[in-house]
Structure formats: structure tokens, C-alpha cells
């Protein structure tokens, strides 16, 4: 007899998600030296642990306190860069400028970058059909708890400039409801981070707009000086000259704005 | 062959301030983080002030609120404003250029250096 089983709103399960999790840990672990003691048989059960046999609809940050621990990893605090639906070139910045650091090139977050993944009440399953839409089902479901967890710690983390890359060509530049904007704000510490400053990435060839004047830039100001923490705008109006002149700032034809 | 040239140290009384200019050439320096560092005798050095590429800036806390950091990138310059000055900031003071965009206070991160300003404040 078939068991009844939830049906959730968002998809299910990356398949082969057991599978991928440890790949990409034993991948990671290989290529960064300074990981090379993590055991990733252990994050996989850490990982595992947090939302197996749990409701899909009741995790908590506790609940992935383990992996956490696990995972734990010191990334240079002045070299952290941030982003808010803009992910691709946050990282092909970031292969660019390699001492700089987003959240998914330490182990967790490459860990889950992509993944879905969610359990049963009372079964040792992962639910391969459906999983918890953030919106129309709850909002503390494994993955979102997982992202929110991760991007807390690597808020809190960061000190002296911290820069956050955000997209020019969304209504809302900067999104409120963002992980960004109701997680990451809210959790750069005041007493180590003097400055916040925002890339807005024009996505229009002939964009000469100054979107540092935007109103959803302007309120990023707002909640960022009230925490006693500067703010600085700036435009990057040919994204892909940007990563040109990251790569080789002394080209000439960097010496024009990007 | 890149060179920075530091200029307008001296001798002045504590409160007083002092305005530090280094001038870079051989190459430019618009999409670098340039920075002030110093060192007193018998110490290392030390971080006081940095600007990245778009223009963000980055204090040690204890000239926080009394020092600020400028560039003219048309000019290839870089400017300390020194205010408020004590005897404790007594030193060398040395302009420094990274070959990346942002600033960082760590020393071993700049690739250019230049041959550096005295700076005495007497109480």
C-alpha cells in the first residue's frame, strides 16, 4: 500500500544529493589545503542529520549546528564579497580576483550552491518529489534555514571594506527580502566593518544612468548609516570591461571608467 | 620603471596638521588601492590609511576621525590630511600602490613602495 506523502509546492530533492554533497566535499577539501583535515564522510552525516526524519516545515538553526562545526573556516575577513541576485558574476569575479571570497567559495556554501534538498517526518527518506516552497508553503525549511544559517556567520565575519555586488536591472536593486538585504545588512558588525560598498551592475550596452541614486540604493543607505557603518555606490557600467581590468588593472583600457 | 614620491613632512607642534602628498609615475594608477603606512623607530610598518580603486576608504582607529585619505586620479596623486597631530604619530610615513583594486592593510600586499616622509610632532 502506497504511503501518503506530502506534497510540497517547490521541487524535490537534487538527485543523487547524498552523492553530490560528498563529491563536492572531497573535491573542495582536495583543492584548499587549509581544509584538507575535514572528514567528509562526517559532513555528509552532519549534513544529513540537520533535516532527515525532521519536518520540512520545522528546521531550525540548531538543527544545523554540527555542520556548522564542521565546516567552520577562516576566510580573510577584508576580502568577502557579497552579492544579491547577481550570483554568476560575483563568482566569475571572484575566479578573477582570487583572494577575494563569496559565500560559496568556502566549503558550505560550495557545498550546497544549486541544491535542494528536504526529509520526512519520522522517515529516514529524502524527498526526492517535493519540497517547501519558501513562500507558499513555510519559510523555515531546510534549505532556506541552511542559507540564512551560513549567510548570518559570513556577515558577521567580514571586517574593514565589504563589498556586495548588486543587479542594476531588477526593479528592486536592493531587495529587503533578500538574503542580502534581511540577513546579511542586519549582521555585518559595526565595530569591525568601516564600509559597505555596493557594485550596481548595469546590464544595458548603452546604460549611463547613475543607479548609486536609485531609491532601493538610497534605503541600503539608510539601514547601513543607522548601523554606524559607511556606505559608498558604485556604478559598473560595462561588467565585462570590470572583470578585464580586475584581471589586468594596468591595460589601458582601464583607464577610463569601467 | 614606477617610482612614488612622497613630500610635505616636517617638524610641527602637536594639534597642528600636515597634509602628506605622493605623486606616482611610471605607470597608472587609477584602478589601484593606494595606502599610507608608517613606522617609527624600532617598529614595523604600520597601516594608516588606504583607498581602493572606486574611491572607499579604510583607517587604523587610531587616526580615525583625524586623518583622510584623497586621490587625484587625473594628477596620479595621493594626499594624507593630518589633523589633530600627536607626538605618538611621529614616524615615516610611506605611500604605498597594490597591483589589485582594493585596499588591505597588510604590508605584504602592496607591490610599490615609495622612500617615505618624516614626520615629527613635538608636545
Known amino acids: 500500500v502506497p504511503r501518503w506523502r506530502q506534497q510540497w509546492s517547490g521541487p524535490g530533492t537534487t538527485k543523487r544529493f547524498p552523492e553530490t554533497v560528498l563529491a563536492r566535499c572531497v573535491k573542495y577539501t582536495e583543492i584548499h589545503p587549509e581544509m584538507r583535515h575535514v572528514d567528509c564522510q562526517s559532513v555528509w552525516d552532519a549534513f544529513k542529520g540537520a533535516f532527515i526524519s525532521k519536518h520540512p516545515c520545522n528546521i531550525t538553526e540548531e538543527d544545523y549546528q554540527p555542520l556548522m562545526k564542521l565546516g567552520t573556516q577562516t576566510v580573510p575577513c577584508n576580502k568577502i564579497l557579497l552579492w544579491s541576485r547577481i550570483k554568476d558574476l560575483a563568482h566569475q569575479f571572484t575566479q578573477v580576483q582570487r583572494d577575494m571570497f563569496t559565500l560559496e567559495d568556502t566549503l558550505l556554501g560550495y557545498l550546497a550552491d544549486d541544491l535542494t534538498w528536504c526529509g520526512e517526518f519520522n522517515t529516514s527518506k529524502i524527498n526526492y518529489q517535493s519540497c517547501p516552497d519558501w513562500r507558499k508553503d513555510c519559510s523555515n525549511n531546510p534549505v532556506s534555514v541552511f542559507w540564512k544559517t551560513v549567510s548570518r556567520r559570513f556577515a558577521e565575519a567580514a571586517c574593514d571594506v565589504v563589498h556586495v555586488m548588486l543587479n542594476g536591472s531588477r526593479s528592486k536593486i536592493f531587495d529587503k527580502n533578500s538574503t542580502f538585504g534581511s540577513v546579511e545588512v542586519h549582521n555585518l558588525q559595526p565595530e569591525k566593518v568601516q564600509t559597505l560598498e555596493a557594485w550596481v551592475i548595469h546590464g544595458g550596452r548603452e546604460d549611463s544612468r547613475d543607479l548609486c541614486q536609485d531609491p532601493t540604493i538610497k534605503e541600503l543607505e539608510s539601514i547601513i548609516s543607522k548601523r554606524n557603518i559607511q556606505f559608498s555606490c558604485k556604478n559598473i557600467y560595462r561588467p565585462d570591461k570590470f572583470l578585464q581590468c580586475v584581471k589586468n588593472p594596468e591595460d589601458s583600457s582601464c583607464t577610463s571608467e569601467i | 620603471e614606477v617610482q612614488l614620491l612622497e613630500s610635505g613632512g616636517g617638524l610641527v607642534q602637536a594639534g597642528a596638521s600636515l597634509r602628506l602628498s605622493c605623486a606616482a609615475s611610471?605607470?597608472?594608477?587609477?584602478?589601484?588601492?593606494m595606502g599610507w603606512f608608517c613606522q617609527a623607530p624600532g617598529k614595523g610598518r604600520e597601516f594608516v590609511a588606504g583607498?581602493?580603486?572606486?574611491?572607499?576608504?579604510l583607517y587604523a582607529d587610531s587616526v580615525k576621525g583625524r586623518f583622510t585619505i584623497s586621490r587625484d586620479n587625473a594628477k596620479n596623486m595621493v594626499y594624507l590630511q593630518m589633523n589633530s597631530l600627536a607626538p605618538e604619530d611621529t614616524a615615516v610615513y610611506f605611500c604605498a600602490a597594490r597591483s589589485r583594486m582594493f585596499v588591505t592593510r597588510s604590508p605584504d600586499e602592496y607591490d610599490y613602495w615609495g622612500q617615505g616622509t618624516q614626520v615629527t610632532v613635538s608636545s
Open positions: 583607498m581602493s580603486w572606486s574611491g572607499s576608504t
Open positions: 611610471g605607470r597608472t594608477f587609477r584602478n589601484s588601492a
